[in-house]
């Protein structure tokens, strides 16, 4: 049971929030240097499996990026290697160590006073922006039915506190760009759009920056529109049935419809030896239709109890809505009880139901 396509829920995974990393090391390297980061286990105890993350994305080992449980090496560093690095416990995603790395264009050297000054200026309490909940930012494509409310969030931190701005399809995004406007909550790192429409489709990028660096995340929004159509009946239902005289039978019919469907079960009958009327319309009798106390679920099943030979024949599930009708049919074959079959065999004849 659910609320249908536009009203379906995606549950949230439980999260073990890690502490905000208290000690954020600031490191400045020169272009071409080897960046070496080390993260010993807290208190010297066992650390368990860890992952190294840069700007919220897990680092993939390569010839240039050497990843160990307590150490990370990035060889031949370039400007692109600047950013927020953290070592996290793999299971809990708890941040064990956090580093703000800046790679300057000039190669560093032991007597490069500017480099030294720059490193000292940053101080241990300053740092480039980093995502505070990177493990929850992995859902990049959001498919949302029209009329719902969407909130994009890019929770981040850094010192000084970073600013956040938003782009839509690479361009600055402001309230006047959409009917209904937008809500920007800088403290929540969020962008809210109420009652989304198809024109809201696109790529939304948050840009989080301070003087030490910039990080960004792009979400793609798809707004699902429902085009009205007549009811869709699940293929293969109702299915043909063969039953023994006196047994119970159930026919099933699964109906999908945007507009509220009206479901009926019909049995094809003969009138004066004919199955169809003068206009070619089949003769039917209505077996089941919506009543005061019948739910759609109940209407999707037709139950026949203690079937007789008269119950054999063609049955139709008919579903209609404001757009049109759909129907599927199935046959019921009723066989005699086993004793009758045995007697028929002994008499040398075969009964065909």
């Amino acid at each position: 049971e659910s609320l249908g396509t536009e009203q379906r829920v995606v549950g949230r995974a439980a999260e073990v929030p890690g502490p905000e990393p208290g000690q954020q090391e600031q490191l400045v390297f020169g272009s071409g240097d080897a960046v070496e980061l080390s993260c010993p286990p807290p208190g010297g105890g066992p650390m368990g499996p860890t992952v190294w993350v840069k700007d919220g994305t897990g680092l993939v080992p390569s010839e240039r990026v050497l990843v160990g449980p307590q150490r990370l090496q990035v060889l031949n560093a370039s400007h692109e290697d600047s950013g927020a690095y953290s070592c996290r416990q793999r299971l809990t995603q708890r941040v064990l160590c956090h580093f703000s790395v800046r790679v300057t264009d000039a190669p560093s050297s032991g007597d490069d006073e500017d480099g030294e000054d720059e490193a000292e200026d940053t101080g241990v309490d300053t740092g480039a922006p980093y995502w505070t909940r990177p493990e929850r930012m992995d859902k990049k494509l959001l498919a949302v039915p029209a009329a719902n409310t969407v909130r994009f969030r890019c929770p981040a931190a850094g010192n000084p506190t970073p600013s956040i701005s938003w782009l839509k399809n690479g361009r600055e995004f402001r309230g006047e760009h959409r009917i209904g406007g937008i809500k920007l909550r800088h403290q929540q790192w969020s962008l809210v759009m109420e009652s989304v429409v198809p024109s809201d489709r696109g790529n939304y990028t948050c840009v989080v920056e301070n003087k030490f660096g910039s990080i960004r995340q792009t979400y793609t929004l798809d707004v699902l529109e429902r085009s009205p159509h007549r009811p869709i009946l699940q293929a293969g239902l109702p299915a043909n049935q063969t039953a023994v005289l006196g047994s119970d039978v159930e026919f099933h019919c699964k109906v999908y419809s945007d507009a509220q469907p009206h479901i009926q079960w019909l049995k094809h009958v003969e009138v004066n030896g004919s199955k169809v009327g003068p206009d070619g319309t089949p003769y039917v009798t209505v077996l089941k239709t919506a009543g005061a106390n019948t739910t759609d679920k109940e209407l999707e099943v037709l139950s026949l109890h203690n079937v007789t030979f008269e119950d054999a024949g063609e049955y139709t599930c008919l579903a209609g809505n404001s757009i049109g009708f759909s129907h599927h049919s199935a046959w019921l074959v009723v066989l005699p009880a086993e004793e009758e079959l045995v007697e028929a065999d002994e008499a040398g004849s075969v009964y065909a139901g």
Partner: antibody
């Protein structure tokens, strides 16, 4: 203006049934579900169940399962709540509310009720 | 099934701050909505997704949600804030709506 207008007050005897209607206007009816919530005198809000106006699917609170039926008529943009086998403790104000989906990129999908009907008082008394 | 706990009553002097709490096991892992209900009226949504105000709701209202407690805060309380306040979550396991018991705000 988005509105939910409910049917008038009802007085019923124990064992009877009541059917409350909720007519929607000012928005596209099939884009939002309808929830039913009741409030006994001096008590808090109690969720009963809801219906998808999109496909008629329903979901009921365990407490009311088998005794309540929620339906919709898209041709008139109206939702209905029928409660059977009434007892004196069913005396309450019954509200319908529009169900809105909220999608958060970090937290996922959640539902709330952004528009409410004015309420229908149902009194069950012998 | 989620269980949400709210204190039954709260009294605040005009101009002061009212803080409503809604307790639940790991409620911080869910999104919380808040409703205000004045006597004889239907409830009104005043906060959704923990922190978002619907249009028409004053900036004096703010929300937060962390750990086992969600909070609705009203600063500079006025007489017209007197009402019952309910928190609500969506229980994705059962596809059910769950309300807290409500807190009655009295403005002294």
């Amino acid at each position: 203006e988005v509105q939910l207008v409910q049917s008038g007050a009802e007085v019923k005897k124990p064992g009877a049934s009541v059917k409350v209607s909720c007519k929607a206007s000012g928005y596209m009816f099939t884009s939002y579900g309808i929830s039913w919530v009741r409030q006994a005198p001096g008590q808090g809000l109690e969720w009963m169940g809801w219906v998808s106006t999109y496909n008629g699917d329903t979901n009921y609170a365990q407490k009311f399962q088998g005794r309540v039926t929620v339906t919709t008529d898209t041709s008139t943009s109206t939702a209905y709540m029928e409660l059977r086998s009434l007892r004196s403790e069913d005396t309450a104000v019954y509200y319908c509310a529009r169900v809105l989906g909220y999608y958060d990129s970090i937290d996922g999908y959640y539902y709330g009720m952004d528009v409410w009907g004015q309420g229908t008082t149902v009194t069950v008394s012998s | 099934q989620s269980v949400l706990t709210q204190p039954p009553s709260l009294s605040v002097a005009p101009g002061k701050t009212a803080t409503f709490t809604c307790g639940g096991n790991n409620i911080g892992d869910k999104s919380v909505h808040w409703y205000r209900q004045k006597p004889g009226q239907a409830p009104v949504l005043v906060m959704y997704l923990d922190t978002e105000r619907p249009s028409g709701i004053p900036e004096r209202m703010s929300g937060s949600n962390f750990g086992n407690t969600a909070t609705l805060t009203i600063t500079r309380v006025e007489a017209e804030d007197e009402a019952d306040y309910y928190c609500q979550v969506w229980d994705s396991g059962s596809d059910h709506v769950v309300f807290g018991g409500g807190t009655k705000l009295t403005v002294l």
